[in-house]
């Protein structure tokens, strides 16, 4: 048989348990709230530092581009991919269609004031969806020239001529002072490419790389 | 030996035509932009149209748009200017000049002695 | 349009000595190393010869004491030494985009 405590020893005994308790919770309670302060400052440093790289990134293009329009990459909430308002976007890409008439050189110029470079047209995709944006009546520069009027024709990127994936109308390019390119809409052809004097005052398409913040 | 030689000025009265011609030779004429700049008196030069090799392309300052029209002939050898409605501050020399293309742009390497067109009531 | 402002409007230069006529555009007629801005000699009574064209290509026959130089929107043509028959008007013209402008003109006298 267990010999009773005495009341003293109770009290004790009750007091040591008690304090046993009292000092895990404290200790309990320290390490959540360590965890917690941990797991809210990581994120919200991680997230502060982003948005100030964002901000930074932004300011970059205000000169030019006063807003821009974003739209969410992905699931991830924190990766965004801009273009100009006024703008369109395709695939990773922004393009603007240019409705001041002016030369070849001059709309590069004005392209690249805005960070971007007259049209590159790498597949039949890009071109289907930049015609919808263009007027039939109307004939566009494309990034494409052939200064030294050798039928040599280069893009404005460097991008590689390629023969194989070109849109000439039919007969086209047929003149060796015509050094420039645009894209126009033929009745029995639809949309093509054409080359023409660059001198000659067109509408042009401007296009650039989609900004990712 | 390239030649160029204009035809076809004279004295006019405001509101008349005269049509102006440029016979070339020694060159593939059908190869070229050609062009018409013209030359009041004592005054500097002044470009009045321009029309491209194949005929696909027509340009003309503001200060004759409408009133001039530029056009060729490449089986004969000819460039054309038409005037019509003439001003006596269209009274100049005019030249017929051939175009050479260089990179973007293009420089007039050929000259015609030019023809005096004198509009005056 | 672009504007071209020719200066001086006249100058008397003595044989062997330089001439120099600048041009000034109104906006850059440069575009990736080229530079579209030509000159002519005109004589009196004559139509206008071309001496240079892309700023700094002599035309074939002209004497290499015509030179010419610049970029973007100031241009040079210098003549060194001058010759007696070089008294004319001097006119730049740029092709960059029409319409196609010139210069007022420059008259070189020879003292």
């Known amino acids: 048989m267990v010999p009773e405590e005495e009341p003293q020893d109770r009290e004790k005994g009750l007091w040591w348990f008690q304090l046993k308790v009292w000092s895990m919770a404290v200790v309990s309670i320290l390490l959540l709230s360590v965890c917690f302060t941990v797991s809210s400052v990581v994120p919200h440093n991680f997230m502060y530092s982003k948005t100030v790289k964002r901000l930074s990134k932004l300011r970059e293009y205000q000169q030019y581009h006063p807003s821009l329009t974003c739209v969410m990459e992905g699931k991830d909430i924190e990766d965004w991919s801009c273009c100009p308002t006024p703008w369109t976007s395709f695939q990773s890409s922004c393009y603007f269609i240019s409705t001041g008439m002016q030369s070849w050189t001059k709309s590069q110029k004005n392209c690249s004031v805005m960070g971007a470079d007259l049209v590159v047209i790498n597949t039949r995709e890009e071109q289907d969806f930049i015609i919808q944006n263009l007027k039939r009546n109307s004939s566009y520069f494309l990034g494409l020239s052939d200064p030294g009027g050798r039928r040599h024709w280069q893009w404005v990127d460097q991008t590689p001529y390629n023969e194989n994936v070109t849109f000439w109308h039919s007969g086209e390019p047929n003149n060796l002072d015509e050094r420039c390119a645009i894209i126009n809409f033929r009745s029995s052809e639809e949309w093509g490419w054409n080359d023409i004097h660059c001198h000659v005052p067109q509408k042009s398409i401007c296009k650039m790389k989609k900004i990712y913040i | 030996e390239v030649q160029l030689v204009e035809s076809g000025g004279g004295l006019v009265k405001p509101g008349g035509s005269l049509r102006l011609s440029c016979a070339a030779s020694g060159f593939t004429f059908s190869s070229y932009g050609m062009s018409w700049v013209r030359q009041a008196p004592g005054k500097g030069l002044e470009w009045v149209a321009t029309?491209?090799?194949?005929?696909?392309?027509?340009y003309y300052p503001d200060s004759v748009k409408g009133r001039f029209t530029i056009s060729r002939d490449n089986a004969k050898n000819s460039l054309y200017l038409q005037m019509n409605s003439l001003r006596a501050e269209d009274t100049a020399v005019y030249y017929c000049a051939r175009q050479l293309y260089y990179s973007y742009g293009y420089y007039f390497d050929y000259w015609g002695q030019g023809t005096t067109v004198t509009v005056s009531s | 349009d672009i504007v071209l402002t020719q200066s001086p409007a006249s100058l008397a230069v003595s044989p062997g000595q330089r001439a120099t006529i600048t041009c000034r555009a109104s906006?850059?007629?440069?575009?990736?190393?080229?530079?579209?801005m030509h000159w002519y000699q005109q004589k009196p009574g004559q139509p206008p010869k071309l001496l240079i064209y892309?700023?700094?290509n002599l035309e074939s026959g002209v004497p290499a004491r015509f030179s010419g130089s610049g970029s973007g929107t100031d241009f040079t043509l210098t003549i060194n030494p001058v010759e007696a028959n070089d008294a004319a008007n001097y006119y730049c013209?740029?092709?960059?985009?029409?319409?196609?402008?010139f210069g007022g003109g420059t008259k070189v006298e020879i003292k």
């Open positions: 029309i491209s090799s194949g005929d696909s392309y027509t």
């Open positions: 892309a700023a700094s």
């Open positions: 906006e850059s007629v440069s575009f990736h190393g080229t530079h579209l």
């Open positions: 013209q740029q092709s960059i985009e029409d319409p196609p402008t």
